[in-house]
């Protein structure tokens, strides 16, 4: 058993049929010694008396809010949560496996630049009685500070019969140099509590590996005289690290119709303009990627050919 | 310490091309190592990230773009003395700061060159003959060093009398290649910045 936060404790259980469970001793936080009774949740049934209460925790029915009283007055609470371990593996029931970039990916993180600011998100089908808390650091043995905000519900989607909820959190490394060469990864730890179930999820990464620039901005077209060719120009996204001559981007320019299976014109360039062939009912799209370290491409920025 | 804006004329910076070749060569070599050593811990997640130049050179700090010198997190108190002549400078306007930067890059390359050559000698003794260093990568390191053209003491190649542990050597190769790729990215950024300034 360990303390998650004040008056909230996590009991780690090996989860299999007829498992013996864990013996837990609760102590009432009071100077009083006599006349103390214990109850669980809303029940008025007295579970025991005395300053300490010893319980055998085997299942979710044994978890919950234990309260010690004296003469009708509440003295203190202890909330017991369960953390299940099945076949030596901690349960991952609360969050959905996003399976990208690989299986067992519960947390996904992205950074728009090298400033040390990043966003992580996760998915669940659970809509109520759900709380998250996020901690992060650079390295684990001698951790350096990363400050994370509160996790918030950022999107709701319908997937077949199920509703899916996306939560996200923003974090900022306390003293980040955009030009630094990372040797210790960022560690992100998410505590998830659903009713009386506790789970924790972690992710470890270098900012350089989670870079995904914003799309290029200010796309403009200039038709070339006596030609089907069009000059398309754009600018670096505002959120990208500066100076741009140091943090350079490379671009992919594509002309395509509505369907992905249609013909296309595609060219890669390090410049902020390119010449392409425009077709009727097609769009010109441009996306960006770090020129020197190939992490993710940005989303497309698009303008119609016409 | 930082790079000033007064730098060579645009397009006249002879090291940019070499640095691009360097990044390409080390990336290819790392990819080859990951594929060939698929049953060894050779991915970014599996290896320890070591920097053989730590406390010996200070490339990131010496080559910091002027715009980042206002960022206190980028300013490191490490001071290293460097030799200050070199052909990539290509302009009299080039300052002492830029010489420090290019000199630091040269020292990095020299250190990695020695490590890679020592390692290759060991890998050539491996009866499995599983992996060797790409001669192109070694040639590209040499070309960039020649373009930088700093006079510096030659570092003797480390020779080892004991029987090499090939498993450890291959793990070390992965560690070195990952670190060198990161440094090659920095070098490419620096050269691009200098070329544009």
């Amino acid at each position: 058993i360990w303390e998650l936060k004040k008056d909230v404790y996590v009991v780690e259980l090996d989860w299999y049929p007829d498992a013996p469970g864990e013996m837990v001793v609760l102590t009432c936080d009071t100077p009083e010694e006599d006349g103390i009774t214990w109850t669980l949740d809303q029940s008025s049934e007295v579970l025991g008396s005395g300053k300490t209460l010893t319980i055998q925790v085997k299942e979710f029915g044994d978890a919950g809010q234990y309260t010690c009283h004296k003469g009708g007055e509440v003295l203190s609470h202890s909330l017991l949560l369960l953390h299940k371990k099945e076949d030596g593996i901690w349960s991952t029931d609360i969050l959905k496996d996003q399976k990208e970039p690989k299986n067992k990916t519960f947390l996904r993180c992205e950074a728009k630049n090298y400033s040390g600011r990043f966003t992580c998100w996760w998915l669940t089908t659970i809509s109520t009685d759900l709380t998250f808390s996020v901690k992060s650091s650079r390295g684990s043995s001698d951790p350096q500070g990363v400050t994370c905000g509160a996790a918030t519900l950022s999107a709701e989607r319908v997937r077949g019969d199920n509703k899916e909820y996306e939560y996200s959190v923003e974090c900022q490394e306390d003293s980040a140099c955009p030009a630094a060469e990372e040797s210790l990864p960022i560690e992100v730890m998410v505590d998830a509590v659903h009713k009386l179930k506790y789970e924790n999820y972690t992710s470890s990464f270098f900012i350089r590996d989670i870079i995904k620039p914003d799309p290029p901005k200010n796309l403009q077209l200039k038709p070339l005289k006596n030609s089907r060719q069009v000059e398309v120009s754009w600018e670096y996204p505002d959120t990208w690290s500066t100076p741009h001559s140091y943090f350079s981007l490379t671009f992919c320019v594509q002309v395509q119709g509505k369907s992905k299976r249609e013909k296309k014109d595609r060219v890669f360039t390090d410049k902020t303009s390119a010449t392409v062939i425009c077709r009727k009912n097609a769009s010109i799209s441009v996306r960006a990627q770090d020129r020197y370290y190939s992490s993710s491409w940005s989303e497309w920025a698009s303008v119609p050919c016409s | 310490r930082n790079l000033p804006v007064a730098t060579p004329d645009p397009g006249m910076f002879p090291c940019l091309h070499h640095s691009q070749n360097l990044l390409r060569a080390v990336s290819n070599m790392l990819q080859k190592a990951r594929q060939t050593l698929e049953f060894y811990p050779c991915t970014s997640e599996e290896i320890d990230h070591e920097d053989i130049t730590k406390d010996k050179t200070s490339t990131v700090e010496a080559c910091l773009p002027l715009e980042l010198t206002k960022n206190e997190s980028c300013l490191n108190s490490r001071e290293t003395s460097f030799i200050t002549n070199g052909s990539c400078l290509a302009s009299r306007k080039t300052s002492f700061m830029m010489a420090l930067c290019l000199s630091s890059i040269y020292e990095d390359l020299k250190m990695y060159q020695v490590e890679f050559k020592t390692m290759n000698a060991k890998l050539l003794m491996d009866p499995k003959r599983q992996i060797f260093l790409d001669q192109n990568m070694l040639a590209v390191i040499d070309e960039l060093m020649q373009a930088l053209n700093f006079n510096s003491e030659t570092v003797p190649q480390k020779s080892s009398l004991e029987e090499p542990d090939f498993y450890k050597t291959k793990i070390k190769l992965c560690i070195l290649l990952h670190a060198f790729r990161i440094r090659a990215v920095t070098i490419d950024r620096v050269m691009s910045y200098l070329n544009a300034s």
């Epitope: 490379t250 249609e262 296309k264 595609r266 890669f268 360039t269 390090d270 010449t275 077709r279 | -």
Partner: antibody, heavy 118, light 107 residues
Framework: QVQLVQSGAEVKKPGSSVKVSCKAS????????LHWVRQAPGQGLEWMGW????????EYAPKFQGRVTITADESTSTAYMELSSLRSEDTAVYAC???????????WGQGTLVTVSS | DIVMTQSPLSLPVTPGEPASISCRAS??????LHWYQQKPGQAARLLIA???QSISGVPSRFSGSGSGTDFTLTISSLQPEDFATYYC?????????FGQGTKVEIK
């Protein structure tokens, strides 16, 4: 299986024109750009131009502009390349090639030898 | 026009040995570079697109690298069916242009 089958070899007199055909099978004809590339004996490959069979749009290499005409007939899934004012240096193997991507070629025809000789 | 220069023009190789062909562009073309194989009397075959992207159905012994002005096609272990002429082609701008070809011959 996508295939491009070209017409047979031709012998032409200087100053005349030649029209080479390229019949596509497999896949929808108008879903692909179609290009013509030539190779003179002992020389490298030379791109001549492309056509979008969907709308008849064409673009030609400046070197051939005014002498080459690329057309397409959707009903027969056939593209044509006509080269006029032939000279001896136009002796070459002419190949058609296609792709959904405009700027490179994933399927090639077997080539048609055009000999220009007086 | 962008001029593509291949080297060497002739490459004698022992079967089973690796082979590398170089292609240089007269100006930077990013990764807009493609490789083809051609055998006498046969249609050309696309091997690599955009400098390093492998093509479905092409053996994994063929790989490409490079960006900017310098590109390489590598055949890790030459098989008897690989003896042919190889061409690079730039797609950075029109007109599309090719290298002069490299003939890989049996040593």
């Amino acid at each position: 299986q996508v295939q491009l089958v070209q017409s047979g070899a031709e012998v032409k007199k200087p100053g005349s024109s030649v029209k080479v055909s390229c019949k596509a099978s497999g896949g929808t004809f108008s879903d692909y750009y179609l290009h013509w590339v030539r190779q003179a004996p002992g020389q490298g490959l030379e791109w001549m131009g492309w056509i979008d069979p969907e709308n008849g749009d064409t673009e030609y290499a400046p070197k051939f502009q005014g002498r080459v005409t690329i057309t397409a007939d959707e009903s027969t899934s056939t593209a044509y390349m006509e080269l006029s004012s032939l000279r001896s240096e136009d002796t070459a193997v002419y190949a058609c090639a296609r792709n959904k991507e405009l700027r490179y070629f994933d399927v090639w025809g077997q080539g048609t030898l055009v000999t220009v000789s007086s | 026009d962008i001029v593509m220069t291949q080297s060497p023009l002739s490459l004698p190789v022992t079967p089973g040995e690796p082979a590398s062909i170089s292609c240089r562009a007269s100006q930077s073309i990013s990764i807009n570079l493609h490789w083809y194989q051609q055998k006498p009397g046969q249609a050309a075959r696309l091997l690599i697109a955009f400098a390093s992207q492998s093509i479905s159905g092409v053996p994994s012994r063929f790989s490409g690298s490079g960006s900017g002005t310098d590109f390489t096609l590598t055949i890790s272990s030459l098989q008897p069916e690989d003896f042919a002429t190889y061409y690079c082609q730039q797609s950075n701008s029109f007109p599309l242009t090719f290298g002069q070809g490299t003939k890989v011959e049996i040593k």
